[in-house]
């Protein structure tokens, strides 16, 4: 387990951080500069840091189940489960399904009445008794109902010529009813004679294109439970056809653009608004059937079996049976399909928010196990043989109290699951003694919760009317910075920097913006190691005797001394025993400056005043020429010849001394003065 936390300052925030996080409520667990977040860590880490096991808060997810022994037959148990969910930690509980014998059945026979189903209709008219007898072999309470469909009554689905609308059959002599989308003929009943009578009145109809409007009809059968007469029992919908089906989008062919709304629109037992709404999508229909616990049995002719098998992959709890061309085998087909459907159990739940995740482990009676599936699934379930599903529910965050329902598809039983958050820490109320918080707060899980007007680890700081924003403002470098650089707590308007887990790293500075390791390294050590220097806010500060950007040099100047033992000839600084010369001067000792401008012109007035006490500096020579010293003997250096203030040529030699703008000057005795014209 690991605990990844971000800015945790309470036990609740810690528990919300992840299932591996636990909280130490021990008093004085944190040292100076330690943030409260160090109380939040994995159990082994807290134990290692000296937190006693009974001081560790680690609430766990749990499940409580309740049986409801009232009411009739129950195929699912328990009936109610209460879950306390800690974020990220699953709560698991078992749901048992025991298939009951003789469970009541409602069977609605929905038949395609397009012309090609003429011979099928003849057979179905005689079916009533057989169907009920077959149901009564399975259950003590069976009911049957009947409805029929053709298609939407607009082009290109049917021929809209008035004659063809009156009689759509190819054979004009044949008595044939006008096309319609869906007609609810007989409400669910246990009277087989009524079935025979009402179905006996039905006439065949016809349409134009091959696919039929069967999905429209199925949607109405599912959406109109009162009109159809569905009870809260096993609901079977037999869908008999010899062709395919239109689905969402096909309505556009007839200029029908409004999506199917999944609502009941029966008027006088007819779906009269079928030309206003598009066909439903397969997904929409699947959802509606599941929502209403209706299990479809597709009784289709051989050439359509593959198509409808594809459909059953999308519609849960549905089956396909091959219908003989004249529907003579329909009773046998229904019995087989029912056995197949009722021996397969799907456990599923209603829609949930993103914050809840549910998975199922199915332990089926035949030894087959499916783990971590989005729904439970067992096949070959026998009567009275219990099967178990383990349901695991996980919350991704501290959730609001809520409920959801788990049901076995096609059955009416439900398990109600109430979900509650498990985010509070039931810390020992260590003490009502407020002295631990300077009498200005109370302890909660080892931390002082301060009264209004007080803040600080022990409520030691009075805000004195300053808002927390004002106090926090003193803990920010500027408006765009985070408080204490995110590395400290703002206490009384001052940053208290956190203790670092990194060996040798101290966090410091007015805004905790500095540390002792983020500096240049020498020999693999910060600032050359603790004996050479210290890392201060990103720059090395070297101890006496060391220098350099990483304190890599021992402080000595031997290599920088010129023959007169002047460091860098006074024209540079010695760093790491090497001269750093002022601009233009050359290494190694900053003696020469080949690129510097000639000093001759600069010093003519000085030569004139020093030697002849004449010129502009005559009265102020020593102040105007502080760097120059007159020599009585010739010197080595730069030879100059410049005109003085009287127009005479003066020859002089400048010998550079150590330092900047310092020269020894020797000036020739004689000047060359050219007489002007008379």
């Amino acid at each position: 387990q690991e605990c990844t936390k971000f800015k945790v300052s309470s036990c609740r925030e810690c528990i919300e951080s992840g299932p591996g996080c636990t909280w130490c409520q021990k008093l004085n667990f944190t040292g100076p500069g330690d943030p409260d977040s160090i109380r939040c860590d994995t159990r082994p880490q807290l134990l290692m840091r000296g937190c006693a096991a009974d001081d560790i808060m680690d609430p766990t997810s749990l499940a409580e189940t309740q049986e409801d022994h009232n009411g009739g037959q129950k195929q699912l148990s328990p009936q109610k489960v209460t879950l306390y969910l800690r974020p990220g930690q699953a709560a698991a509980f078992n749901v048992t399904f025991r298939r009951a014998k003789g469970y009541p059945i409602d069977l609605y026979y929905l038949m395609d009445l397009s012309y090609s189903m003429l011979d099928d209709l003849r057979n179905v008219k005689k079916l009533g008794g057989d169907l009920l007898r077959a149901l009564n072999e399975i259950t003590e309470s069976g009911r049957i109902g009947f409805g029929s469909f053709v298609d939407k009554t607009v082009l290109p689905f049917v021929n809209t010529h008035p004659d063809k609308l009156r009689n759509p059959c190819p054979n004009k002599e044949k008595e044939c009813q006008p096309p319609f989308a869906f007609r609810h003929v007989l409400k669910l009943t246990n009277n087989s004679n009524q079935f025979q009578t009402e179905v006996g009145k039905q006439l065949i109809s016809g349409n134009l294109d091959a696919p039929e409007g069967g999905l429209d009809a199925m949607m109405q059968v599912a959406a109109c439970p009162e009109e159809i007469g569905w009870r809260n029992v096993t609901r079977l919908l037999v869908f008999a056809t010899d062709d395919g089906f239109h689905f969402a989008g096909d309505g556009k062919l007839g200029a029908i653009l409004t999506p199917n709304d999944g609502r009941c629109h029966l008027e006088d037992n007819l779906y009269k608004r079928s030309n206003e709404f598009d066909y439903p999508s397969v997904g929409q229909l699947a959802h509606k059937l599941a929502e209403n616990n209706i299990q479809p049995i597709f009784a289709v002719t051989s050439r359509m079996v593959k198509t409808y098998e594809k459909l059953t992959e999308i519609i849960p709890k549905s089956a396909v049976g091959e219908l003989s061309e004249d529907s003579s085998n329909v009773v046998h087909l229904i019995k087989n399909a029912y056995n197949k459907l009722s021996s397969r159990v799907f456990l599923d739940h209603n829609a949930l928010p993103d914050t809840l995740k549910v998975t199922y482990d199915s332990f089926c009676s035949n030894g087959v196990t499916h783990r971590n599936q989005p729904r439970g699934d067992c096949d070959g379930v026998q009567i009275n043989v219990p099967i178990t599903f383990q349901v695991k529910v996980t919350a991704t965050e501290c959730i609001q109290e809520q409920s959801f329902v788990i049901r076995a598809l096609g059955f009416t039983d439900i398990v109600t699951v109430q979900v509650l958050p498990q985010c509070e820490c039931r810390c020992r109320d260590q003490s009502r003694d407020r002295s631990l918080c300077h009498g200005k707060g109370f302890l909660e899980c080892g931390i002082c919760r301060c009264d209004t007007g007080y803040i600080g680890k022990n409520c030691e700081c009075q805000t004195q009317g300053r808002s927390s924003q004002e106090l926090e403002g003193s803990c920010r470098k500027d408006n765009n910075s985070i408080i204490c650089s995110g590395l400290g707590d703002c206490v009384c308007g001052q940053c208290l920097c956190h203790t670092s887990d990194v060996p040798g790293k101290l966090i410091y500075g007015q805004y905790c913006e500095c540390d002792t390791i983020n500096c240049e390294r020498y020999n693999g050590q910060v600032c050359g190691g603790p004996g050479r220097g210290l890392c201060f806010c990103g720059k090395c500060r070297c101890h006496p005797g060391f220098e350099g950007s990483a304190c890599q040099c021992e402080r000595t100047t031997e290599g920088c001394l010129n023959p007169r033992r002047v460091e860098c000839s006074g024209r540079g600084r010695c760093r790491c025993n090497v001269c750093e010369c002022h601009s233009g001067y050359q290494l190694p000792l900053c003696q020469e400056c080949p690129g510097c401008p000639s000093p001759c012109g600069k010093y003519i007035s000085c030569a004139e005043c020093l030697k002849f006490e004449k010129g502009p500096f005559g009265k102020n020579c020593s102040a105007a020429c502080p760097g120059l010293q007159l020599s009585n003997n010739p010197v080595k250096g730069r030879t100059c010849k410049e005109r003085d203030s009287e127009g005479c040529w003066v020859a002089y030699t400048l010998e550079q001394q150590d330092g900047m703008d310092r020269y020894l000057i020797y000036v020739d005795e004689s000047r060359e003065c050219v007489a002007g014209p008379n």
Epitope: C495, C497, L506, Y508, F536, C537
Partner: nanobody, 115 residues
């Protein structure tokens, strides 16, 4: 001008204790980091312990568990409590303090641990 003045050094027997103090005289400065360094004869000065204004501290491995560094920010004073002293703890102990602009050192106080 700010000066650091160490006190509390002296001669002590192995296993004994000493408490060093370092007071900053002069203007009231905020020291971001303060530390103790020692210099054994013929060796460069080396870190003993370092402490931030928040009270977080670092110690040299050789003194962990025996020495405790602390500071009183109100008095601008640094302390080093030295217990279970060993002969190898002998040396001149220097106080060091850092502001944003300055790196200040004391003149040192001698600690001698005899066996």
């Amino acid at each position: 001008e700010v000066q650091l003045v160490e006190s509390g050094g002296g001669l002590v027997q192995a296993g004994g204790s000493l408490r060093l103090s370092c007071a900053a005289s002069g203007s009231r400065l905020r020291f971001e980091l303060m530390g103790w360094y020692r210099q054994a004869p013929g060796k460069p000065r080396d870190l003993v312990a370092l402490i931030t204004s928040s009270g977080s501290a670092n110690y040299a491995d050789s003194v962990k568990g025996r020495f405790t560094i602390s500071r009183d920010n109100a008095k601008n004073t640094l302390y080093l409590q030295m217990n279970s002293l060993k002969p190898e703890d002998t040396g001149v102990y220097y106080c060091n303090a850092h502001t944003y602009t300055d790196n200040l050192w004391g003149q040192g106080t001698q600690v001698t641990v005899s066996s």
